[in-house]
């Protein structure tokens, strides 16, 4: 749809790419919801956080996550249009000292408590897939995205450009 000849084309260098510095260039708070407007919520259970995908009641407050944007070290000019910008990676933190992590072995998305510098599993390449939606691709596993499966977040392999706009890997960011 966007002249993509496969996900790998844009992220093949992810395994080798490092983050410029240890400080994000930009941070802000936003709530995260699915393409179908279900909210991503976080609950403390038995001293660990669980992540849920659920419909909120009308006046129920949405959980916010801190989105931190980091520049990759090398310009990502694979697109062929002479773009000289640096690829952006994000980390997502719903509460202090906890970050979303990709567990590639279990194909799951988990909240881990950790100190900076954050591990590679906490970084996701940001994509604009579809109108006002974004997607999050694992830095540690190109072609694998955060997605929704059985009312939970999971890691979903996307193996062709046609599947890039599949609804279960599309998310909306909202500041309200």
């Amino acid at each position: 749809a966007f002249g993509i000849s496969g996900v790998q084309k844009y992220t093949r260098a992810l395994h080798d790419s490092s983050i410029t510095g240890i400080s994000p260039i930009t941070e802000y708070l936003a709530s995260l919801s699915t393409y179908n407007d279900q909210s991503i919520t976080f609950a403390l259970e038995d001293e660990s956080y669980e992540i849920y995908v659920e419909d909120l009641k009308k006046d129920e407050k949405k959980d916010k996550v801190l989105l931190s944007y980091y520049e990759s070290q090398h310009p990502s000019n694979e697109s062929g249009d002479g773009v000289d910008g640096k690829m952006l990676m994000v980390t997502l933190s719903p509460t202090k000292d906890f970050w979303l992590h990709a567990n590639n072995k279990e194909h799951s998305v988990e909240l881990h408590k950790c100190e900076k510098p954050l591990p590679d599993q906490a970084f996701f390449v940001l994509h604009n897939m579809h109108s006002n939606c974004v997607s999050f691709e694992c830095k540690t596993d190109p072609g694998v995205f955060i997605g929704v499966k059985d009312n939970h977040l999971a890691l979903i392999k996307v193996d062709s450009s046609e599947n890039l706009c599949t609804e279960n890997i599309l998310f909306k960011l909202s500041e309200t």
């Epitope: 930009t26 802000y28 936003a30 000289d84 940001l126 974004v134």
Partner: nanobody, 121 residues
Framework: QVQLVESGGGLVQPGGSLRLSCAAS????????MGWHRQAPGKQRELVAV???????NYADSVKGRFTISRDDTKNTVYLQMNSLRAEDTAVYYC???????????????WGQGTLVTVSS
């Protein structure tokens, strides 16, 4: 190619005001956020303010209540209204945007060349 062009910098007295503008152009498909950073001589570049596509904003503590960021989505332009300027606001102000192009879904970070703001009597 994506270009960011800043304007509006200059010399202003303490307590004065300036309005910076930054226009993004090129093969832009979606802009996620636009913001301003600054770099004073001998210091690291720091975030001043950012405004997201949804209208959310974030400000550095040092400029809260004095600076206001806004954007015009129709023109892919961001503005920084700077009031009650102080000597310590003297810096080169850089526009930064996160955007994707028509040829790639990957969101990239783009920077302008910078505009100098000098606050001095």
């Amino acid at each position: 190619q994506v270009q960011l062009v800043e304007s509006g910098g200059g010399l202003v007295q303490p307590g004065g005001s300036l309005r910076l503008s930054c226009a993004a152009s090129g093969s832009i498909r979606t802009v996620n956020y636009m913001g301003w950073h600054r770099q004073a001589p001998g210091k690291q570049r720091e975030l001043v303010a950012v405004v997201t596509s949804g209208g959310g904003t974030n400000y550095a503590d040092s400029v809260k209540g004095r600076f206001t960021i806004s954007r015009d989505d129709t023109k892919n332009t961001v503005y920084l209204q700077m009031n009650s300027l102080r000597a310590e606001d003297t810096a080169v102000y850089y526009c930064n945007a996160a955007a994707s192009t028509y040829s790639s879904t990957v969101v990239r970070s783009f920077w302008g060349q910078g505009t100098l703001v000098t606050v001095s009597s």
